[in-house]
């Protein structure tokens, strides 16, 4: 348990301490206090570097002191022969004696008290980014006007986050632009447009001046754009180093401006606008797009019409065209639909005739009907040749889709009549 | 057939056999049989057979039987209460519509109809073929098909022959332009039981084909001259009747 004060005495004090002893004391005072450790008596065998017998004072990993020999006070008004002031709330005291003592040594008497530390001045690392206020047992940080204390209770920043931009066009600038931006700040701006519009950011080179990168190329102050899983930046330096037009392909963009404690510049200014999300002109074979455009964007509707001899098969129904809409995600609706060759199917049977199986029943295939010769002939002409037409019918040049008609050949006996002479 | 020769059904694949009355007919397409009106006037549901040379019962069982759907007798044919006493055979023509189409082959195929042009006007001496299972010199009915080749003769040749077993005055018998007279050569003639069969003449425009120039109708005496219904005069009626009574499948 932490205590505010205490006494530490070498073994057997004030009698002589024994040989071969190692004893340690862990001193702990409450958080926010330092420790003042002082010795009022010191009588320990002297040796070089206190190698034989010693009392060691350790703070963390640091040895604050190692004592041996005899000491007396330099101040007649004070009994203190040696003292240590540490700005930490923990300290370890270790006493060691070796196997022999040439004389009789009485050891040491020491006392510790919790002392207030000035966190604002006692440390190399300043705990507050702006104003530090010390009090007994602790400190607190405070900020200049228009700054606020971050959740870490140490850093001050400007209140530059939380803005959500939903208008289709707008301008965003760093705090105080074109005056120097605040140090030690993280500014987050959100652009949230209607689905189907992508955020396009436009910057002019001269509208950008942010503390340059260090020698390793790391931005000390940085501007970053995050659109979904895509990131643009970090950007820093004099003059915008990135593309002057950033097409984010997203309707949501987060702009993050991070600054450190030093090197404030004038900052940046950007414009943004919402572009309807583009859809790529997909390669759909055997079809034409209407209307034909160089670029298609969100809500554009095209009619995709199959070329003659091709059709869209959706389920079991054939059509010659379909509509596709450029969707908010930059993809076309009905993208699974394709124009494929028309299949005229198995040719119909005809009475007293036949049709040879075609190699294919697809558009352009040719079939030939023949009649059962010599007993039937093709009455309605056309030669019996049909091709698979674009409308899915087997078509003849003369008859169209009408099937050939095989009618009996008349008046032809298979064998001529020969009169037998009697 | 009097004075004829044995024939094979392949020589006359259009030949149709009627078993009641014993007579003949000519197949003109898949659904229609052409015959003489006097053959069907007494039996409007005749049983017909095609594709067999022999009309022996055992052979007919293996041949193709045709079932009639309807009989169409020419409107100009005068129906009599006592047909046996008939002296007027004008318009002796009828059509039988079949229930099912006939499948054609080497023993079954139709005969052509005459064209309407003057090419199909018969001249005396033009030869025609007759066939049937009717009376022969030897027997009342032939079992195997018989046939003969006869020339067309002037109508007066038929008028001059004395009617054998007349049922009326010789003057009562009617001769009209709707009739063809043929025969008178080597005693070759059609006879009872050959009625309705075709008088087949070679097509003047296609020598490989025969058309039904006439149908066996009547005669004064077997073995002399015979009278045949002049089919050319009825082509319009035949076509109209078939068209009006066909199914879309045939159209």
């Amino acid at each position: 348990e932490p205590t505010m004060y205490g006494e530490i005495l070498s073994p057997n004090y004030p009698q002589a301490y024994p040989s071969e002893v190692e004893k340690s004391w862990d001193i702990e005072v409450p958080e926010g206090y330092g420790i003042h450790l002082y010795f009022t008596h010191l009588d320990i065998e002297l040796s070089e570097n206190c190698a034989y017998d010693s009392v060691q004072i350790i703070s963390g990993d640091t040895e604050e002191g190692r004592l041996c020999g005899q000491r007396s006070s330099n101040n007649p008004h004070s009994p203190i022969v040696e003292e240590f002031q540490v700005p930490y709330n923990k300290l370890q005291v270790i006493f060691k004696s070796d196997f022999s003592n040439e004389e009789r040594f009485t050891g040491f008497a020491a006392y510790y008290v919790a002392t207030d530390i000035n966190e604002c001045t006692d440390f190399v690392d300043v705990p507050c980014s702006h104003f530090c206020n010390n009090f007994i047992g602790g400190y607190f940080c405070s900020c200049p006007p228009e700054y606020f204390l971050h959740d870490d209770m140490k850093n001050c920043g400007v209140n530059c986050s939380g803005d959500v931009f939903t208008a289709l066009i707008g301008e965003i600038a760093s705090p105080n632009y074109p005056k120097p931006y605040p140090e030690n700040s993280r500014c987050e701006y959100q652009i949230r447009l209607e689905k189907g519009f992508q955020v396009v950011v436009t910057l002019r080179r001269e509208d950008f001046d942010v503390e340059a990168a260090d020698s390793a190329g790391n931005c000390l102050d940085s501007l970053v754009f995050v659109a979904g899983d895509r990131q643009f930046g970090p950007y820093c330096g004099h003059g915008f180093p990135g593309p002057l037009n950033i097409e984010t392909k997203s309707n949501a963009l987060d702009i993050i401006f991070q600054t450190d404690l030093t090197g404030q510049k004038k900052g940046w200014k950007l414009r943004y606008h919402g572009d309807p999300m583009p859809c790529p002109k997909e390669d759909t074979p055997n079809s034409v797009w209407e209307p034909a455009k160089a670029k298609y964007v969100f809500r554009d509707v095209v009619q995709i019409t199959c070329l003659d001899g091709f059709e869209v098969v959706e389920g079991r129904v054939g059509a010659t065209s379909f509509y596709s809409t450029c969707q908010s995600n930059g993809k076309w609706s009905n993208s699974k639909l394709k124009c494929q060759p028309v299949d005229c199917g198995i040719p119909e049977s005809i009475e007293n005739g036949k049709v040879e199986d075609p190699e294919s029943t697809l558009f352009g295939s040719v079939i030939r009907y023949t009649c059962e010769e010599p007993y039937y002939y093709m009455e309605n002409g056309g030669g019996g040749e049909y091709h698979c037409a674009g409308n899915g019918s087997w078509v003849n040049e003369v008859l169209g889709p009408e099937l050939p008609k095989c009618v009996p050949v008349c008046g032809v006996p298979r064998e001529p009549f020969e009169e037998k002479q009697r | 057939i009097i004075g004829g020769s044995d024939a094979d059904i392949k020589n006359f694949p259009w030949q149709v056999f009627f078993d009641n009355p014993w007579a003949g007919g000519a197949l003109i397409n898949e659904y229609w049989v052409l015959t003489a009106a006097h053959v069907v006037e007494g039996n409007r549901e005749p049983t017909m057979y095609v594709g067999s040379t022999s009309v022996q019962t055992s052979r007919l069982a293996k041949s193709k039987m045709l079932t009639p759907e309807h009989v169409f007798i020419h409107p100009g044919w005068k129906l009599l209460e006592v047909p046996e006493g008939r002296t007027n055979f004008d318009n002796d023509i009828a059509l039988v519509r079949l229930k099912d189409p006939v499948k054609m082959g080497p023993t079954v195929s139709p005969i052509c109809l005459p064209g309407t042009s003057s090419d199909y006007n018969l001249m005396d001496g033009d030869l025609g073929l007759i066939s049937g299972w009717g009376r022969t010199e030897k027997r009342d009915r032939a079992v195997r098909l018989k046939a003969a080749r006869l020339p067309v003769a002037p109508l007066r040749k038929c008028k001059e022959v004395k009617v054998e077993k007349p049922t009326a005055d010789a003057e009562a018998y009617v001769f009209t332009p709707n009739m063809i007279c043929a025969g008178g050569e080597k005693g070759m003639d059609s006879c009872k039981g050959d009625s309705g069969g075709a008088f087949a003449v070679q097509d003047p425009n296609d020598k490989t084909k025969f058309y039904a120039a006439g149908l066996v109708s009547w005669g004064p005496q077997c073995g002399t001259y015979g009278l045949y219904t002049r089919v050319k005069n009825y082509v319009d009626w035949i076509m109209k009747t078939m068209q009006e009574n066909s199914t879309p499948r045939e159209d």
Epitope: R316, D343, C344, G345, S349, I350, K354, D357, G392 | P248
Partner: antibody, heavy 118, light 109 residues
């Protein structure tokens, strides 16, 4: 006279196989596309498969695709239906039919009964 | 697939009455490819009317068929005892499958 006579039906366990035959006569078999149609007990007609006159092109009902195979032997005037991986829902009277103009089925066999049951 | 819906499912009429059987397709069907079949219990179906309006061989003239697009009708002008049976409509479409209606049972009232 056109005749179609089916055979090969019977009782089979689920997952089993059967081969149906349809013997054709009275017409030129090789001139006609042919189909199999089935009728479950007390139910309506359901088309199963079609084959072109020469046998090169076949079409199937989706639910039998990959399990049934329609074929024909024009030299024997016979149509076949090889049925594998049979299911209870395949239980039906199976008819073969000739496809006529307009793909009407102008002649049908008397049917052969297939029962799939464990 | 094109679904054929027949109505009514059952039609109860007396001999001599007029019967009207309906077949409605879920999408347009070519009239050349719409057919009707008659089936009697325990028997195979018979082609009855083909290509919408053509009577099959041996079908009496009291039967007629009509229709186009998605609506087709089989009509019997004056019912005879032998006409009581189940009637199926059937369509062919080149993309398949061939489909049948569920049937209309024509029964004696």
């Amino acid at each position: 006279e056109v005749m179609l006579v089916e055979s090969g039906g019977g009782l089979v366990k689920p997952g089993g196989s059967l081969r149906l035959s349809c013997a054709a006569s009275g017409f030129t078999f090789s001139n006609y596309a042919m189909s199999w149609v089935r009728q479950a007990p007390g139910k309506g007609l359901e088309w199963v498969a079609t084959i072109s006159s020469g046998g090169s092109h076949t079409y199937y009902l989706d639910s039998v695709k990959g399990r049934f195979t329609i074929s024909r032997d024009n030299s024997k005037d016979t149509l076949y239906l090889q049925m594998n991986s049979l299911r209870a829902e395949d239980t039906a009277l199976y008819y073969c039919a000739r496809l006529f103009t307009g793909y009407a089925m102008d002649y049908w066999g008397q049917g052969t009964l297939v029962t799939v049951s464990s | 697939q094109i679904v054929l819906t027949q109505s009514p499912a059952t039609l109860s009429l007396s001999p001599g009455e007029r019967a009207t059987l309906s077949c409605t397709a879920s999408s347009s069907v070519s009239s050349s490819y719409l057919h009707w079949y008659q089936q009697k219990p325990g028997k195979a179906p018979k082609l009855w009317i083909y290509s919408t309006s053509n009577l099959a061989s041996g079908v009496p003239s009291r039967f007629s068929g009509s229709g186009s697009g998605t609506d087709y009708t089989l009509t019997i002008s004056s019912l005879q005892p032998e006409d009581f049976a189940t009637y199926y409509c059937h369509q062919y479409y080149r993309l398949h499958p061939i489909t049948f209606g569920q049937g209309t049972k024509l029964e004696i009232k």
